[in-house]
């Protein structure tokens, strides 16, 4: 099943996708579409790239903000709404016969948590480190936040929590 990414309404969603250009700098076309990857191309295309640059966007909210020329074709959706929820297809159109790499990811857009005057430690910890999600008979799924998390003290946790909230970073759950 698709990896899930969670973003709050009004924040930016980040859906990772990448490939390694071989040789370096030898870019391949990529499409992002709403809906699972079909047989070829993408359905409901939101963004396309060619061998040089982004050449088609259906809205100014869709961006590739990573190092596109190194194969980072992660999609950023700005100012997400509940309607942005759903499965997205990242298709890396590697030249050849049926060579494409297909990645389906699921974006879950949630309403912002109610603001309380004095957030508790528990709430901040949950924001920084999302709760484990139960996935049927397989038990709790792995959860991650963007980047790696070394040993941190409580002060660092509060700082990280605020940075995540300010940046609108998307939380990933498997």
């Amino acid at each position: 099943s698709e990896v899930e990414y969670i973003a709050e309404v009004g924040q930016n969603a980040y859906l990772p996708c990448s490939y390694t250009p071989a040789p370096p700098g030898n870019l391949v076309p990529v499409c992002w579409g709403k809906g699972a990857c079909p047989v070829f191309d993408c359905s409901n295309v939101v963004l396309r790239t060619d061998n040089r640059d982004v050449n088609d966007r259906t809205s100014g909210r869709y961006w590739l903000k990573g190092d596109f020329h190194k194969g980072d074709v992660s999609l950023t959706i700005e100012n997400v709404t509940l309607a942005d929820s759903g499965v997205y297809c990242c298709r890396i159109q590697i030249p050849g016969i049926m060579n494409d790499e297909k990645h389906n990811v699921k974006l879950v857009v949630i309403k912002p948590a109610k603001v309380t005057p004095a957030p508790t430690l528990q709430r901040d910890l949950t924001s920084a480190f999302p709760r484990m999600l139960t996935t049927g008979e397989h038990g709790p799924a792995e959860t991650q936040t963007p980047g790696s998390l070394p040993d941190v003290n409580l002060t660092q946790i509060f700082t990280l929590t605020n940075e995540l909230r300010d940046s609108g970073a998307t939380i990933r759950t498997a």
Epitope: G35, V39, F40, D41, S43, D50, Q93, G96
Partner: antibody, heavy 120, light 107 residues
Framework: EVQLVESGGGLVQPGGSLRLSCAAS????????WSWVRRAPGKGLEWVSA????????YYADSVKGRFTISRDNSKNTLYLQMNSLRAEDTAVYYC?????????????WGQGTLVTVSS | EIVLTQSPATLSLSPGERATLSCRAS??????LAWYQQKPGQAPRLLIY???NRATGIPASFSGSGSGTDFTLTISRLEPEDFAVYYC?????????FGGGTKVEIK
């Protein structure tokens, strides 16, 4: 107005070759994936092959894999199908078909078709 | 490959009547299903895509529904020009496949 005009069909002997062309006009050719679809006499529609907007990625039905090659020339707004090692069962009307504007593997415009007859 | 079974093979109706055409997939195709109309000597014409979206220029009398394995094309009121062969096509799994067609003929 979108126009798709196929050419290159005809009578060919088993084992022979043909090259079909599809000239397109009326829209931005490079953005869309394209396909060839055929209809054999008395039968239904069969998808044959597809090519991505860039032309780098190609897709084939098992029945033609290794014998047919799809290609496109974006500068000429033209789609091609090179058909080698033709068999009697390849006899059909061949249509070029444009993929949907926002992707998806349905076909929103079709040519009128060109007849390929494989017979000795 | 996914097999699409269309029923009935032939539908005999009069102008003004309602036509209901069925397409059943051998496994789920989500909502990745399209419907086409084809008349003798003509190219197919896209009617419906993504199971329920009407293509540009298609009259409101045509509607599509369903998801997963069972799909329906409905023509609410048959006009003389609607008598033709109708095909469904799935694009959720390789290879793309079409149904065998339903012929809607004048009774």
């Amino acid at each position: 107005e979108v126009q798709l005009v196929e050419s290159g069909g005809g009578l060919v002997q088993p084992g022979g070759s043909l090259r079909l062309s599809c000239a397109a006009s009326g829209f931005t050719f490079r953005q869309n994936a394209w396909s060839w679809v055929r209809r054999a006499p008395g039968k239904g529609l069969e998808w044959v092959s597809a090519i991505s907007g860039s032309g780098g990625s190609t897709y084939y039905a098992d029945s033609v894999k290794g014998r047919f090659t799809i290609s496109r020339d974006n500068s000429k707004n033209t789609l091609y199908l090179q058909m080698n090692s033709l068999r009697a069962e390849d006899t059909a009307v061949y249509y070029c078909a444009k993929g949907g504007d926002y992707g998806g593997n349905y076909f929103d415009y079709w040519g009128q078709g060109t007849l390929v007859t494989v017979s000795s | 490959e996914i097999v699409l079974t269309q029923s009935p093979a032939t539908l005999s109706l009069s102008p003004g009547e309602r036509a209901t055409l069925s397409c059943r997939a051998s496994q789920s195709v989500s909502s990745y299903l399209a419907w086409y109309q084809q008349k003798p000597g003509q190219a197919p014409r896209l009617l419906i895509y993504d199971a329920s979206n009407r293509a540009t220029g298609i009259p409101a009398s045509f509607s599509g529904s369903g998801s997963g394995t069972d799909f329906t094309l409905t023509i609410s009121r048959l006009e003389p020009e609607d008598f033709a062969v109708y095909y469904c096509q799935q694009y959720g799994s390789s290879p793309l496949t079409f149904g065998g067609g339903t012929k809607v003929e004048i009774k």
